[in-house]
Structure formats: structure tokens, C-alpha cells
Interface confidence: medium
């Protein structure tokens, strides 16, 4: 979708120009997760709403099977927030007995999968120890940064424990990317 | 402000081009909040600095009466950080007595108001339980994502408790949006 | 690198157009920090990887000596995440004894240095009290916003305690900026 600017000889054009409105973009929102088998030692991937409510994909950015598909090489801003909620963690009970312990934790990873590369690449990670004493708890992890992506790359969001993800509202847990 | 590119027949142009420098943009910074009556069951909205220091609005993006006014339809990246600070929460005292309790919490919501739609739309929410034991506490909640907005839409930032917002520094609590 | 569009008289062009691909951009990733002398009452600056792995600088955006150098005036989105990790804080031990105390804290600041201004400007601050009871802890602070920057400005990331920064993975601690 990038057209070479053919311009009069007096016009300096340094690179192909393109309208902002035709750039690949997506904002995906949380849905209730169906429990799935995931590989041991590999965080499960979330699946997403891509059409209803605030969610959309446009300009050849497609969503399929937990992945955002990158349709065009370039620099993208990629972001996600996952809101977690849980009951008192075991760690806090151990703490109350005065025994220090490796804390429970919550983690979000935005991962890139490239067909030509055997291993997924972790682009962004937000990880937080959770040691709450005597109550329900809830909190978000937000991530966002710019990456050079290639046509055909696939992006997904992985979490440490899918059962802790708050799927109740589209504004609490989301995932997006846009070509700069 | 978008002009159709009339171009020679050999030039492919896919959409109107526009200069990046003329896109609507705003970065607003915190000011001391004046206590106001707000509707029961509705979080109060923050008001903001829009000219001094790091704050600015440009290219027809205007700020008025707690709202950022969207002057042109398109995809916008919208963000906010609110830093909260408070004293020991009641919940922590209850906890110390060993009685689990629904935790106190802090919440930020970026809300869209559309004249043609009776209900505000919550675009983004960051919500966190706060159960600090025996001290002052402080922490930020950050939000940011892309949304398709319409000319005339209004954006505001709502918080669960205006008295807990840290208004002391422009770099701690802020709100912004820009057309992509 | 901005060329005036010379166009037929029937074409409305409102400002110089420029290709998105030639805009200054950088994403820097964490490296192990070498202890350095820093001024009393001034948070130390982190240094960064700018070429390997996910890190890059392009289109005249240069990294040198802990600074990102802004090569062109304009509006930039600037972001950083710093993941901190530590052992039980002293404050939590004091808390356990039932004595309230000013909490330990972790802070990230994105700072602008301008040759025309003798004091650095704090653009963004994320600050959080840390009072963990009886364990190791870890957590990220994320920041991001838009600022009008001038050619020659320099950006850096300062932290309250360099020894608490998690430098183990490029996806946990990072710093970036791009011209909008």
C-alpha cells in the first residue's frame, strides 16, 4: 500500500509517503478464557475480542487464534494491560507464620513468533511479586513499547496464570498494536 | 485539514495525506483539585493544566471543563497516569486483627462522552487493591491505548477518590491524547 | 529532511509532508549497570544497550553516554519501564513490630537536559512505596507520554537506587522515544 511518489523534478521527496489512515492497527479486548492445555514451562496465551465494543482490527492487521498478524514490515507500537485478581496467596499465609518465602507472582509477556525463527521472542515482560495478607486482591500490569516487526510476524500475550486474569470488562484487560 | 492529493495518473495515492505537525495533540498535567459535588456511584473527574509547564494543546485539540475535546475523527492514542498517596487503609487494620476484608482500592478510568449517546463509555480502567500495613503509601496507575474517536467526542479522567490524587508535581499525574 | 510539497495549484497542501519511515526513533534495552559516582541528592542515570537484540536507534536519533539525543524538534512519545527487585525492606520489619514508618520506595524519572536551561526538567515520574513483609519482591514501573522536544535536547532515565534495577532481561527494563 505504499506508492512511490512520482513528482515534478522540482519536488524533493525523500521516501514513499502514505496516508496515516491506511496503516495497520488493532485494539483487542478481553473475553472469558476457555481453559486450554498449554505446554509445561510455557505461559498460556490469551485469546481476544477483535470486533465488538471497543475492539477493532483494520488495514490488513488481522487477529486469528490468539495472534495478531503483522501485515507489513515497519516500526510498531505494541501495548497490553492485563488486570489480575485473586484470593489471598499462599505466600502471605507462610509470611504470617514468619517464614520468608519466594513470593507468588503475576507476569505478562508480549511475545513475537516468526516463522523463520524457531524460538519465540519475548518483546515485553511485566512481572510482579504478589504477597497480599488476608484478602482478595486485584491489580493491573501495563506494557508498551516500539519494535521493528516484519511482515508475517505474529504477536500474542502470555500470562503466568490464566485463571487470575480479570475478563469482566473490556477496559481492564486489552492488547493492541499500530504501525508508526 | 485533510486535502485530497490530486496527482498524475501514474502516481498511486491511497488516501488523503496530511502533515504530522498539524495533528490534534494534548498533554495535560495535574493541578490541585477543587472539591466538587459528584453524583453518587460516579467517580469524580479530574481537572487539568493545559498551558503551563509541560502541558499543551495544539491543532484544534481543546481542553475545557475537565474534558479534552476531539476535533477530528480518527484513531487516537490516549494515556494517563495518576499517582495516588494515602495513609494506612482501614483494611490493613482489620487485617492486622486477622479478619480478611474486601480491600480498599484505587481506580482510574478514562471515559468517553459522546453527545449522541446517553451513557459515557469507559475506554480504559486501572484498578488496584491497596492494603498497606502501618505507613503512608504512594503508587501510580498508568493507562494507554488506541481508540477510534469521532469529532465532538469528549475525554475525561475519573478517579475513585479525588483526595488521594498526588497533585504536587506535573510529572506524576498527567493525561494526554494524540491523533495517529 | 522535510521537503515542501510542490503540487499543482488545485491541490491543497497544508504543511510539509514527510515519510514516516524516516522519523527519529529509538528503543533501548537494559544492560548490567556499572556503579558510578552520582551527585548527592540526584538520582543516578541508567545506561543502555542501543544496538543488540531488540534495541535500535534510527534516523539520526543517537544514543551516547546514557542520553538519547533528540535530532529534530517536534512532538515525541517517550516511554520507559524499569523492573525493580529487592529483598525484604527494612520498613517491613519495623512495620511487623507495629511501628509505622515512612516506607521504602522505588522511583523512575525520565529527565530532559536542554542546553538552554541550567536545571534538568523531569518529564515523567513513577514512584511507589515498597513495604514487603518477609520475602524477595519484584515489580515494574511503566511511564509514557508525549512531549514537545527541541533539537539538541537529551533524555535520560534516572532511578532511586541503581542496585535494585533488574538488568537480567531486555524485555523487563527498557527506554524509548519516537517522533510523532
Amino acid at each position: 500500500l505504499k506508492g512511490q511518489e512520482f513528482a515534478p523534478s522540482h519536488q524533493q521527496v525523500y521516501a514513499p509517503l502514505r496516508a496515516d489512515g491506511d496503516k495497520p492497527r488493532a485494539h483487542l479486548t478481553v473475553v472469558r478464557q476457555t481453559p486450554t492445555q498449554h505446554l509445561k514451562n510455557q505461559f498460556p496465551a490469551l485469546h481476544w475480542e477483535h470486533e465488538l465494543g471497543l475492539a477493532f482490527t483494520k488495514n490488513r492487521m488481522n487477529y486469528t487464534n490468539k495472534f495478531l498478524l503483522i501485515p507489513e514490515s515497519g516500526d510498531y507500537f505494541v501495548y497490553s494491560q492485563v488486570t489480575f485478581r485473586g484470593m489471598t496467596s499462599e505466600c502471605s499465609e507462610i509470611r504470617q507464620a514468619g517464614r520468608p518465602n519466594k513470593p507468588d507472582s503475576i507476569t505478562v509477556v508480549i511475545t513475537k513468533v516468526t516463522d523463520s525463527y524457531p524460538e519465540p521472542t519475548q518483546l515485553l515482560m511485566g512481572t510482579k511479586s504478589v504477597c497480599e495478607v488476608g484478602s482478595n486482591w486485584f491489580q493491573p500490569i501495563y506494557l508498551g513499547a516500539m519494535f521493528s516487526l516484519q511482515e508475517g510476524d505474529k504477536l500474542m500475550v502470555n500470562v503466568s496464570d490464566i485463571s487470575l486474569v480479570d475478563y469482566t470488562k473490556e477496559d481492564k484487560t486489552f492488547f493492541g498494536a499500530f504501525l508508526l | 485539514l485533510k486535502g485530497q492529493e490530486f496527482a498524475p495518473s501514474h502516481q498511486q495515492v491511497y488516501a488523503p495525506l496530511r502533515a504530522d505537525g498539524d495533528k490534534p495533540r494534548a498533554h495535560l498535567t495535574v493541578v490541585r483539585q477543587t472539591p466538587t459535588q459528584h453524583l453518587k456511584n460516579q467517580f469524580p473527574a479530574l481537572h487539568w493544566e493545559h498551558e503551563l509547564g509541560l502541558a499543551f494543546t495544539k491543532n484544534r485539540m481543546n481542553y475545557t471543563n475537565k474534558f479534552l475535546l476531539i476535533p477530528e475523527s480518527g484513531d487516537y492514542f490516549v494515556y494517563s497516569q495518576v499517582t495516588f498517596r494515602g495513609m494506612t487503609s482501614e483494611c490493613s487494620e482489620i487485617r492486622q486483627a486477622g479478619r480478611p476484608n474486601k480491600p480498599d482500592s484505587i481506580t482510574v478510568v478514562i471515559t468517553k462522552v459522546t453527545d449522541s449517546y446517553p451513557e459515557p463509555t469507559q475506554l480504559l480502567m486501572g484498578t488496584k487493591s491497596v492494603c498497606e500495613v502501618g505507613s503512608n503509601w504512594f503508587q501510580p496507575i498508568y493507562l494507554g491505548a488506541m481508540f477510534s474517536l469521532q469529532e465532538g467526542d469528549k475525554l475525561m479522567v475519573n478517579v475513585s477518590d479525588i483526595s488521594l490524587v498526588d497533585y504536587t508535581k506535573e510529572d506524576k499525574t498527567f493525561f494526554g491524547a494524540f491523533l495517529l | 529532511l522535510k521537503g515542501q510539497e510542490f503540487a499543482p495549484s488545485h491541490q491543497q497542501v497544508y504543511a510539509p509532508l514527510r515519510a514516516d519511515g524516516d522519523k527519529p526513533r529509538a528503543h533501548l534495552t537494559v544492560v548490567r549497570q556499572t556503579p558510578t559516582q552520582h551527585l548527592k541528592n540526584q538520582f543516578p542515570a541508567l545506561h543502555w544497550e542501543h544496538e543488540l537484540g531488540l534495541a535500535f536507534t534510527k534516523n539520526r536519533m543517537n544514543y551516547t553516554n546514557k542520553f538519547l539525543l533528540i535530532p529534530e524538534s517536534g512532538d515525541y512519545f517517550v516511554y520507559s519501564q524499569v523492573t525493580f527487585r529487592g529483598m525484604t525492606s527494612e520498613c517491613s520489619e519495623i512495620r511487623q513490630a507495629g511501628r509505622p514508618n515512612k516506607p521504602d520506595s522505588i522511583t523512575v524519572v525520565i529527565t530532559k537536559v536542554t542546553d538552554s536551561y541550567p536545571e534538568p526538567t523531569q518529564l515523567l515520574m513513577g514512584t511507589k512505596s515498597v513495604c514487603e513483609v518477609g520475602s524477595n519482591w519484584f515489580q515494574p514501573i511503566y511511564l509514557g507520554a508525549m512531549f514537545s522536544l527541541q533539537e539538541g535536547d537529551k533524555l535520560m532515565v534516572n532511578v532511586s537506587d541503581i542496585s535494585l534495577v533488574d538488568y537480567t532481561k531486555e524485555d523487563k527494563t527498557f527506554f524509548g522515544a519516537f517522533l510523532l
Epitope: - | - | N62, T64, N65, K66, F67, L69, P71, T111, V113, T114, D115, S116, Y117, P118, E119, P120, G152, K154
Partner: antibody
């Protein structure tokens, strides 16, 4: 302690090139900007230009741009000024100045006389 | 160039007097700087960002203003304040100074 010391010949012939060096100590030059400012006898202060030592980027006063060059050698902690094709009107005290993120600091100045 | 017009060019006042110097920029600037220069010495920064007192500068010195009109004040003139004072803008290229105000004691 922060110090800036200008050095160079006190006398330069007309049409020659004036060369001054500023040697800095007590701070990392890469964290700052380094300027040259001059003051002609009985006149006010005139900013000549600056360099960003970290990257080597320069900015010059347009009125002097065709004649002035500022360079840096970070390994020696030095910034240099060259002013070509000098005339008697370039007789002045030349100051090296640090700015940027720190209280600005001036050298004590170096008097350069242009005379045959 | 942004022209800086400083006034008066000189003034004479008694110890303890309030002294005010003004500086007008030919176009709006965000920040203004004020320097003190004693005979045979390098200039010393007193005020930055229009109103911020530089480190170690006595509180009798102050600055105010915005846009094109700025003011520098010595609230109570002291003998050691005899000097020439310059305003400066750092925004346009080139950076430009006012022509200076020479302050003397009556």
C-alpha cells in the same frame, strides 16, 4: 571542583585564524553543552556557538557561521574554538561556558587581541 | 534574531534601595536569564527560567515576567551589587543578550 580554563595565543594577526582551547575538569563533558561567548572592549556579550560534546552536534551564531568552528576532544576533556579571517573587530575576551542540566559555569576568559 | 532591549542602560541608587531593570524581547520567549558581571570577571548566573534563583544567589535578587516583558529586581541594594547586569534569551538562534545595565552606588 568544576573548572573551565581557556588557553591560546593572546595576539593574532589580521586575516589569520584565532584558535582557543577550553580544558575542563571536575565534571563529565558528555553530560553538558559547551559554548563560546565573547565580549568586545566596552561592549556587551555575544554568543558565538555551542557544541554538544556527547554527539559533536554544533550550533553557531548565524552572523559568525561562515567563520566559526567549534570542536571537542572528549578524551582530553577539551573544547576548541576556531575563528577564521579575523579583523580588529574580533579583539575580545573569549569565554568558555558550560550549560545544560547543571548550573552554568564560565571560564575566567581569555583576552585575544587582533593586531598587526 | 530575537533582539533584547534592556533599560535603563545605567542607574545610580543608594544602599538599601529597591532596584528594577527591565528587558523586552522582540518576540515572545519562554525563559529569561539574568547575569551579573563585575569588572574584570566572568558573568555569573543569578536567575534562570525568568524567576528561578540560581544556587548560592542571595534572595534579594529576583526575576519575573513572561512573553516579551521581563523584570529583574534587587530588593535592597548592597555595596557588593555594583556590577553590570545582563538579560539573555536562550531560545532563538542566536542566543542574544541585552546590552547591559550598569548599577552604581550614589
Amino acid at each position: 571542583q568544576v573548572q573551565l580554563q581557556e588557553s591560546g595565543p593572546g595576539l593574532v594577526r589580521p586575516s589569520q585564524t584565532l584558535s582557543l582551547t577550553c580544558t575542563v575538569s571536575g565534571f563529565d563533558m558528555g553530560d553538558t553543552y559547551m559554548h563560546w561567548v565573547r565580549q568586545r572592549p566596552g561592549r556587551g556579550l555575544e554568543w558565538m556557538g555551542r557544541i554538544e560534546p556527547a554527539a559533536g552536534h554544533t550550533k553557531y551564531n548565524p552572523s559568525l557561521k561562515s567563520r566559526v568552528t567549534i570542536t571537542r576532544d572528549t578524551s582530553k576533556n577539551q573544547v576548541s574554538l576556531r575563528l577564521s579571517s579575523v579583523t580588529a573587530a574580533d579583539t575580545a575576551v573569549y569565554y568558555c561556558v558550560r550549560s545544560g542540566g547543571l548550573p552554568d559555569v564560565w571560564g575566567q576568559g581569555s583576552l585575544v587581541t587582533v593586531s598587526s | 534574531d530575537i533582539q533584547m532591549t534592556q533599560s535603563p542602560s545605567s542607574l545610580s541608587a543608594s544602599v538599601g534601595d529597591r532596584v528594577t531593570i527591565t528587558c523586552r524581547a522582540s518576540q515572545g520567549v519562554e525563559y529569561m536569564y539574568w547575569y551579573q558581571q563585575k569588572p574584570g570577571k566572568a558573568p555569573k548566573l543569578l536567575i534562570y527560567g525568568a524567576s528561578n534563583l540560581a544556587s548560592g544567589v542571595p534572595s534579594r535578587f529576583s526575576g519575573s515576567g513572561s512573553g516579551t516583558d521581563f523584570t529583574f529586581t534587587i530588593s535592597s541594594l548592597q555595596p557588593e551589587d555594583i556590577a553590570t547586569y545582563y538579560c539573555q534569551q536562550w531560545e532563538g538562534n542566536p542566543r542574544t543578550f541585552g546590552q547591559g545595565t550598569k548599577v552604581e552606588i550614589k
